[in-house]
Interface confidence: medium
């Protein structure tokens, strides 16, 4: 740091004074010197370091008419809104010829009410769930002692007793306010008041209770909600993304979820209008007058298979002597699962009905008993999944084959001598 030489008398005739005040104070430091010849630029030092961006003004007044006469130079340093960083020892510095001169020091001090570096923040917490609040204040003067208040009631007998920078709250059952008082020798400052809103705890134990092809019944255990009864719970379901799935805790599903509201109690809901044999992810949140809980993690569930909702379409049945050719198309109605095959039933007017499992083929050639003289032969077809048979088609009478009609050759299926199954017509 520059130091004044003692070889010549100091040019300074006025040195900086002292300022002590509270934060935000505005003040001015002033130094004055008398020099012969051209006036020098006055620099300001704080704690021995030149202030490059000081808010200073310099006034120069000649004492004679000649440039070589004496000049009075006054430099003023303005401190606006006093802060802790402004405190320290201040001096003026000038370079005269080959020499450096510094003034006597003046001091800037900060002393007043405590100043908050950190105040408690508004937040939401789940009922009966521990959390921490923070508060930090400083002087000078030190020490600064804190006193926490809950709903305007002090949590200790006096400042400095009880928790200081961090307040641990073991849990709340109602929305509450918290503030902190900072005390020092100059008095007390009160922080902002933080509102801690008590929300219901996240529901637990979300699980499937029952499943049907197009609906799932789910149940959960509600979390505690403090003094505020739950008003409803909201359940979201989303189609799983073909193996990609939704990771536990993932904030957003890949598509818009189906949202349902459940009155509570009971903590149970039937989700309808779902697709059969389809994976979903579900989650639930519950709401009180104070707001909603957090969502549970996404839970993977799956609807079971159902039976086909309609019979096979466009059934055609023709006979040519002792052979009958039947073909059909897959049901237009939803299959509600994986198609495993078709069942075919046929019956004559005075003969027992016969039930056959055709598999996944959509056509079959039947070898009828005798010469095919059985009268009024009708055929029905049904599709089936793992869940069972769909509805049977209406009976289709066998039409006689006409020349010109295609008669594909297929594996012949002999009619069993006794019916394999009895179908109630």
């Amino acid at each position: 740091a520059p130091r004044g030489t003692q070889a010549e008398e100091s040019p300074f005739v006025g040195n900086p004074g002292n300022i002590t005040g509270a934060r935000g104070l505005t003040g001015t430091l002033r130094c004055q010197l008398q020099v012969q010849g051209e006036p020098p630029e006055v620099h300001w030092l704080r704690d021995g370091q030149i202030l490059e961006l000081a808010d200073s003004t310099q006034t120069q007044v000649p004492l004679g008419e000649d440039e070589q006469d004496d000049w009075i130079v006054v430099s003023q340093l303005r401190i606006t809104s006093l802060q802790l960083s402004d405190t320290g020892q201040y001096q003026c510095l000038v370079f005269l010829g080959h020499q450096t001169f510094v003034s006597q020091p003046g001091y800037v001090g900060l002393e007043g009410l405590p100043y908050f570096l950190e105040e408690p923040e508004d937040r939401t917490v789940a009922a009966n769930t521990p959390f921490n609040l923070s508060c930090q204040a400083q002087g000078p003067p030190e020490p600064v002692d804190l006193l926490w208040l809950q709903d305007a009631v002090p949590l200790a007998t006096a400042p400095g007793h009880g928790p200081q920078r961090s307040l641990h709250v073991p849990g709340l059952n109602k929305t509450s306010s918290f503030s902190c008082e900072a005390h020092n020798a100059k008095g007390v400052t009160t922080s902002r008041t933080a509102t801690i809103t008590v929300l219901p705890q996240q529901p637990r134990n979300l699980h499937l209770v029952s499943r049907q092809p197009t609906e799932l019944e789910v149940a959960w255990t509600p979390g505690l909600s403090g003094i505020y009864p739950l008003t409803h719970c909201t359940l979201q379901a989303v189609l799983s993304d073909d193996g990609m799935g939704i990771q536990a805790g993932e904030p957003d599903p890949p598509e818009e979820p189906l949202t349902s509201q459940a009155s509570v109690p009971p903590h149970q809901l039937r989700l309808g209008s779902l697709h059969p044999h389809t994976p979903y992810h579900i989650r639930v949140a519950c709401t009180s007058s104070q707001g909603p809980s957090s969502w549970t993690h996404w839970l993977p569930v799956e609807t079971p298979e159902g039976v086909p909702l309609g019979p096979p379409e466009n059934i055609s049945a023709t006979r040519n002597g002792s052979q009958a050719f039947v073909h059909w198309q897959e049901p237009r109605a939803p299959l509600q699962g994986t198609l495993l095959g078709y069942r075919l039933a046929y019956q004559g007017q005075d003969t027992p009905e016969v039930l056959m499992d055709i598999g996944l083929r959509q056509e079959v050639t039947l070898e009828l008993q005798g010469d095919g003289s059985v009268s009024n032969l009708t055929v029905c077809v049904a599709a089936y999944t793992a869940a069972g048979d769909g509805p049977w088609s209406l009976p289709v009478p066998l039409e006689a084959w006409r020349p010109g009609q295609a008669q594909p050759v297929h594996q012949l299926v002999k009619e069993p001598s006794t019916p394999a199954f009895s179908w109630p017509w």
Partner: antibody
Framework: QIQLVQSGPELKKPGETVKISCKAS????????MNWVKQAPGKGLKWMGW????????TYADDFKGRFAFSLETSASTAYLQINNLTTEDMVTYFC???????????????WGQGTSVTVSS | DIQMTQTTSSLSASLGDRVTISCRAS??????LNWYQQKPDGTVKLLIY???RLHSGVPSRFSGSGSGTDYSLTISNLELEDVATYFC?????????FGSGTKLEIK
């Protein structure tokens, strides 16, 4: 291999409390729920409920609400069944059975403990 | 609660026989039907889940079938070690419920 080992037979007086343990090994204990099943001598099986081993949340069947409590010691991969205020009706065998994945109980009970018989006699 | 009914409380069959044990649910359980075997020493094992899926280590002579409310367990080639009581259980709806059991003996 997966194993559930239950504590040995118990002889208790009416009004006393019994606590049966079920120690699991061979799998991640907290991934799969634990069911408890009751069987009276020469009778069928009756599901008592299950405990979510991830959250510790128990679910009791209606007939087992009150005197029965499921609990866990996760660090020891052990589930417990406690029965308070024993009566002669409780003189049966109790099974633990590994079950549902995380929060979903609707899975088969694929591994069972060997059973613990409780005798209640004054 | 869903009632599970096993009408045959006991049956006797010869070694090598094909044995079928039936189970009926009081309502549709959407194929969530499990079969358990309890040996005379009391040990319980899962045999079959979701109607017909064999649990690991279960011999292939065991099979299951059915849908809706009616289900059955078949042992195709009865062996001595199959002497046990067999229970069905629905896993569709809480609370889980079991059938009363069918005790299988050798003639």
């Amino acid at each position: 291999q997966i194993q559930l080992v239950q504590s040995g037979p118990e002889l208790k007086k009416p009004g006393e409390t019994v606590k049966i343990s079920c120690k699991a090994s061979g799998y991640t204990f907290t991934k799969y729920g634990m069911n408890w099943v009751k069987q009276a001598p020469g009778k069928g099986l009756k599901w008592m409920g299950w405990i979510n081993t991830y959250t510790g949340e128990p679910t009791y069947a209606d007939d087992f609400k009150g005197r029965f409590a499921f609990s866990l010691e996760t660090s020891a991969s052990t589930a417990y069944l406690q029965i308070n205020n024993l009566t002669t009706e409780d003189m049966v065998t109790y099974f633990c059975a590994k079950g549902g994945y995380y929060s979903n109980p609707i899975y088969p009970m694929d591994y069972w403990g060997q059973g613990t018989s409780v005798t209640v006699s004054s | 609660d869903i009632q599970m009914t096993q009408t045959t409380s006991s049956l006797s069959a010869s070694l090598g026989d094909r044995v079928t044990i039936s189970c009926r649910a009081s309502q549709d359980i959407n194929n969530y039907l499990n079969w358990y075997q309890q040996k005379p020493d009391g040990t319980v094992k899962l045999l079959i889940y979701y109607i017909s899926r064999l649990h690991s280590g279960v011999p292939s002579r065991f099979s299951g079938s059915g849908s809706g409310t009616d289900y059955s367990l078949t042992i195709s080639n009865l062996e001595l070690e199959d002497v046990a009581t067999y229970f069905c259980q629905q896993g569709n709806t809480l609370p889980f419920t079991f059938g009363s059991g069918t005790k299988l003996e050798i003639k």
